[in-house]
Interface confidence: medium
C-alpha cells in the first residue's frame, strides 16, 4: 500500500487524518457536557484511489471489484484505523462525573 | 441505532451485506490461487443515514457534523463491524498451501 | 488433530430413509466445505454431495439427485445427509470428508458408517 | 460430466520397483494454469488417503517416491520404490468441475 503522502490525486486528497472544531452545540452535547465546551474532532476524510491505505484482504477486494462494477460496487471508504480517548466532563443525576471515551476521536486512517 | 431493516430510504438501501459472485481473475488472483475459482465476497454496501447502524461515539458525531458541514465532512460509511475467515488453496515455491484469511469475507456491517 | 466421526448408518428397507450425521472437531467448521464420498462393497469410491462452509452452494451426483439432501449446522460443527426413498444400490459405506472449497480435494475422511438398503 | 479411466486394474511389484499408475479423463481437466486432478491411496478397512493434489503437489506427510504428473486428459501416479506398506487400492478423482468423479482404482500388490 501507498503512504500516505503519496497521494495519486494530489496533496491532501486521499484518505487522512482532519481536525474538525465543533462545539457542543455542533455536537448536540448541550445538555448532558459541561467541559471541553469546544471539541477539536479529529476524523478521516479522503479519497480512497487503488490501494491506498488498503487496511486488509477486504479492501484490496474491493478496490479490484469496485474497478470492475462501479455501480454495483462502492470504493473503498476513508475510516478510522484506531482512536485516541478522550475525557468528557458530564451532568448527572447527582452532580457531575468524568467519563472517558475511546472510540470518539480518530487516531489514524485507513481504506476499508 | 436502528437495526437491519428499519432503512428510512427504502428496504434494502441503507448498510446491509451483500453478496458479490467474482472470479479469480476479477479479482486479479488468477496466479497465486487454485482454489476456489468463484469466491462469494459479501461485502457492506448501503448508505448510512442519521444513527443508522452507528458503529460509536465517532459515528455519531459523523453525522452531527456531516448534517452541519456536508461539503466538508462526509457522511459515515458502511464497513464490515466483522468478518468471518476464508480459506485459500495457494500455490507456494515448494507446492500448495492452505492458508486462512480472517480479513477477507464480511461477516456484518455497520456505519462510521 | 482434525477429526470427522459419522454415525446414523444402518439397516433399512427400500423406499425408506435414513438420516446421517457426522460431527466434526480439531478445525474451524464453518470455513470449510464438506463433502459425502461412499463406497459400495468390493467396489470404487463415489462422491455424493457437497455443500459449501456457508451452506449456500450444494452439489448432488445424478444418482443421488432429489432422494438425498446435504444439510450442515455450523453453530453444531456437525454435516448431515438426509436419505429418502433409498434404494439397494445405496447400500454402501459412507464416508464424512473435508472438501475445503469447490475445485479442492478430500484431505480429511471420517472412517464411515455403513447404510445397509435390503428388504 | 468427465469420466475417469484408470490403468491398470491391478499392479503387482516387487520390493523396491518403480510402480506406474495412469488415469485418464474422458475430458480435460486442467485449465491454463492447474490441473484438478488428485490422487487417493486405500488400504484395507482404512478410509482413503490424500496422496497427490493438483496432478503434481504432494500432500504433507506423504513419502517422497510418490509423485505425480499430467495435464489435460492423461495423468499418471508413480511410486519409485515400492514397500510393504505401498499395499492398497489408489483412486484418481478430478474437481474441475461438478459432478466430481474417482477413478476405478488401481490395486497395487507385492510380487
Known amino acids: 500500500a501507498r503512504n500516505g503522502d503519496d497521494c495519486p490525486l494530489g496533496p491532501g486528497r486521499c484518505c487522512r487524518l482532519h481536525t474538525v472544531r465543533a462545539s457542543l452545540e455542533d455536537l448536540g452535547w448541550a445538555d448532558w457536557v459541561l467541559s471541553p465546551r469546544e471539541v477539536q474532532v479529529t476524523m478521516c476524510i479522503g479519497a480512497c484511489p487503488s490501494q491506498f491505505r488498503a487496511a486488509n484482504m477486504h479492501a484490496q477486494i474491493k478496490t479490484s471489484l469496485h474497478r470492475l462494477k462501479p455501480d454495483t460496487v462502492p470504493a473503498p471508504c476513508c475510516v478510522p484505523a484506531s482512536y485516541n480517548p478522550m475525557v468528557l466532563i458530564q451532568k448527572t443525576d447527582t452532580g457531575v462525573s468524568l467519563q472517558t471515551y475511546d472510540d470518539l476521536l480518530a487516531k489514524d486512517c485507513h481504506c476499508i | 441505532a436502528r437495526n437491519g431493516d428499519d432503512c428510512p430510504l427504502g428496504p434494502g438501501r441503507c448498510c446491509r451485506l451483500h453478496t458479490v459472485r467474482a472470479s479469480l481473475e476479477d479479482l486479479g488472483w488468477a496466479d497465486w490461487v487454485l482454489s476456489p475459482r468463484e469466491v462469494q465476497v459479501t461485502m457492506c454496501i448501503g448508505a448510512c443515514p442519521s444513527q443508522f447502524r452507528a458503529a460509536n461515539m465517532h459515528a455519531q458525531i459523523k453525522t452531527s457534523l456531516h448534517r452541519l458541514k456536508p461539503d466538508t465532512v462526509p457522511a459515515p460509511c458502511c464497513v464490515p463491524a466483522s468478518y468471518n475467515p476464508m480459506v485459500l488453496i495457494q500455490k507456494t515455491d515448494t507446492g500448495v498451501s492452505l492458508q486462512t484469511y480472517d480479513d477477507l469475507l464480511a461477516k456484518d456491517c455497520h456505519c462510521i | 488433530e482434525v477429526q470427522l466421526v459419522e454415525s446414523g448408518g444402518g439397516l433399512v428397507k427400500p423406499g425408506g430413509s435414513l438420516r446421517l450425521s457426522c460431527a466434526a472437531s480439531?478445525?474451524?467448521?464453518?470455513?470449510?466445505?464438506m463433502s459425502w464420498v461412499r463406497q459400495a462393497p468390493g467396489k470404487g469410491l463415489e462422491w455424493v454431495a457437497y455443500?459449501?462452509?456457508?451452506?449456500?452452494?450444494?452439489y448432488y451426483a445424478d444418482t443421488v439427485k432429489g432422494r438425498f439432501t446435504i444439510s450442515r449446522d455450523n453453530s453444531k460443527n456437525t454435516l448431515y445427509l438426509q436419505m429418502n426413498s433409498l434404494k439397494t444400490e445405496d447400500t454402501a459405506v459412507y464416508y464424512c470428508?473435508?472438501?475445503?472449497?469447490?475445485?479442492?480435494?478430500?484431505?480429511?475422511w471420517g472412517q464411515g458408517t455403513t447404510v445397509t438398503v435390503s428388504s | 460430466d468427465s469420466v475417469l479411466t484408470q490403468s491398470p486394474d491391478s499392479l503387482a511389484v516387487s520390493l523396491g520397483e518403480r510402480a506406474t499408475i495412469n488415469c485418464r479423463a474422458s475430458?480435460?481437466?486442467?485449465?491454463?494454469?492447474?490441473?484438478?486432478m488428485h490422487w487417493y491411496q486405500q488400504k484395507p478397512g482404512q478410509p482413503p488417503k490424500l496422496l497427490i493434489k493438483?496432478?503434481?503437489y504432494l500432500e504433507s506427510g506423504v513419502p517422497d517416491r510418490f509423485s505425480g504428473s499430467g495435464s489435460g486428459t492423461d495423468f499418471t501416479l508413480k511410486i519409485s520404490r515400492v514397500e510393504a506398506e505401498d499395499v492398497g487400492v489408489y483412486y484418481c478423482?478430478?474437481?474441475?468441475?461438478?459432478?466430481?468423479?474417482f477413478g476405478g482404482g488401481t490395486k497395487v500388490e507385492i510380487k
Open positions: 478423482q478430478h474437481s474441475r468441475e461438478f459432478p466430481w468423479t
Open positions: 475430458k480435460s481437466v486442467s485449465t491454463s494454469t492447474y490441473s484438478y
Open positions: 493438483y496432478a503434481s
Open positions: 470428508t473435508r472438501a475445503l472449497v469447490e475445485n479442492a480435494y478430500f484431505d480429511y
Open positions: 480439531g478445525f474451524t467448521f464453518s470455513s470449510y466445505a
Open positions: 455443500i459449501s462452509s456457508g451452506g449456500d452452494n450444494i
